[in-house]
Interface confidence: low
Amino acid sequence: YDFTNCDFEKIKAAYLSTISKDLITYMSGTKSTEFNNTVSCSNRPHCLTEIQSLTFNPTAGCASLAKEMFAMKTKAALAIWCPGYSETQINATQAMKKARKSKVTTNKCLEQVSQLQGLWRRFNRPLLKQQGSSDYKDDDDKHHHHHH
């Protein structure tokens, strides 16, 4: 899915109001320095691509985060504010239902959610260019698109 046409400010508002708190709740009891952030993103569409992947795609050691509160709210925000997103997720939802029924918080899942926090953090301050500053200059032009 191409996240370019999402309403980023509405997604940001959803994150600040609820998703961020749910991520903190999930990570409660974990030191903020416990995991190194190895996943990064360079602009808002790319951040959402990475967020979508880490939140909804099963990985080794962390079969599913999809039933967590932050994941459901993430899905709702993307469905509402990203045109056509819902349609692309029908097959993915079926796969998630089969993935896992019991909720076990593994260390790998905690690490994955720590990465998610970093991605959301980057999404929220994409680059100065998107702060409404007309005299913005970007000397590195780090606007890569990564496709999954």
Partner: antibody
Framework: EVQLVQSGAEVKKPGASVKVSCKAS????????MNWVRQAPGQRLEWMGI????????SYNQKFKGRVTITRDTSASTAYMELSSLRSEDTAVYYC??????????????WGQGTTVTVSS | EIVLTQSPATLSLSPGERATLSCRAS?????MHWYQQKPGQAPRPWIY???NLASGVPARFSGSGSGTSYTLTISRLEPEDFAVYYC????????FGGGTKVEIK
């Protein structure tokens, strides 16, 4: 512990340039913005500009446009502020201040100790 | 640019008294940050986003406001509270108010 350590005091002649450094430690330098703020003797704080160490993006206070240049060296976790065409009214304490997104807004949560720049003939 | 006007410029009060510092913006802003500064020191974050106290700030401090009008209140002044307080906004670039000096009467 987050620390911002600035370079030492400078005395410059009118028309010259000054470059102040700000060495960051205790956090990932590219994760947060860095502001430069100055304060003339007995005056209010005055925002000069900001840099995103992540990609080098800058934004400046229009008052200083063309005279101030903010750069960074990510390998040294250091931000720099260069002010050119100095005049006596540029005599001030110059601060770097990390800006983080927290509490629903960007706030300057850690400040350097300040660098005194004196412009005198 | 959004101009922030702080009043009064100087507030002369005695320890134990209540202090009310005002910050008005030339146009509406989403929130206001407050910083405390003592002579010869760098500013310190004091109140984030209108009403969130920074780490280590005593509960006698509080912040409120919205739109163009924001207030920092000290319920009972302690000797260490005498300093200059600056408001700062981010809604449009970054600007600081002129500061309010809280001095001992």
């Amino acid at each position: 512990e987050v620390q911002l350590v600035q370079s030492g005091a400078e005395v410059k002649k009118p028309g010259a340039s000054v470059k102040v450094s700000c060495k960051a430690s205790g956090y990932t330098f590219t994760d947060d913005y860095m502001n430069w703020v100055r304060q003339a003797p007995g005056q209010r704080l005055e925002w000069m500009g900001i840099i995103s160490p992540y990609n080098g993006g800058t934004s400046y206070n229009q008052k200083f446009k063309g005279r101030v240049t903010i750069t960074r060296d990510t390998s040294a976790s250091t931000a720099y502020m260069e002010l050119s065409s100095l005049r006596s009214e540029d005599t001030a304490v110059y601060y770097c201040a990390r800006e983080d997104y927290d509490y629903d807004g960007y706030a300057m949560d850690h400040w350097g100790q300040g660098t005194t720049v004196t412009v005198s003939s | 640019e959004i101009v922030l006007t702080q009043s009064p410029a100087t507030l002369s009060l005695s320890p134990g008294e209540r202090a009310t510092l005002s910050c008005r913006a030339s146009s509406s802003v989403s929130y206001m940050h407050w910083y405390q500064q003592k002579p010869g020191q760098a500013p310190r974050p004091w109140i984030y986003a209108t009403s969130n106290l920074a780490s280590g700030v005593p509960a006698r401090f509080s912040g409120s406001g919205s739109g163009t009008s924001y207030t920092l209140t000290i319920s009972r002044l302690e000797p260490e509270d005498f300093a200059v307080y600056y408001c700062q906004q981010w809604s449009s670039n970054r600007t600081f108010g002129g500061g309010t000096k809280v001095e001992i009467k």
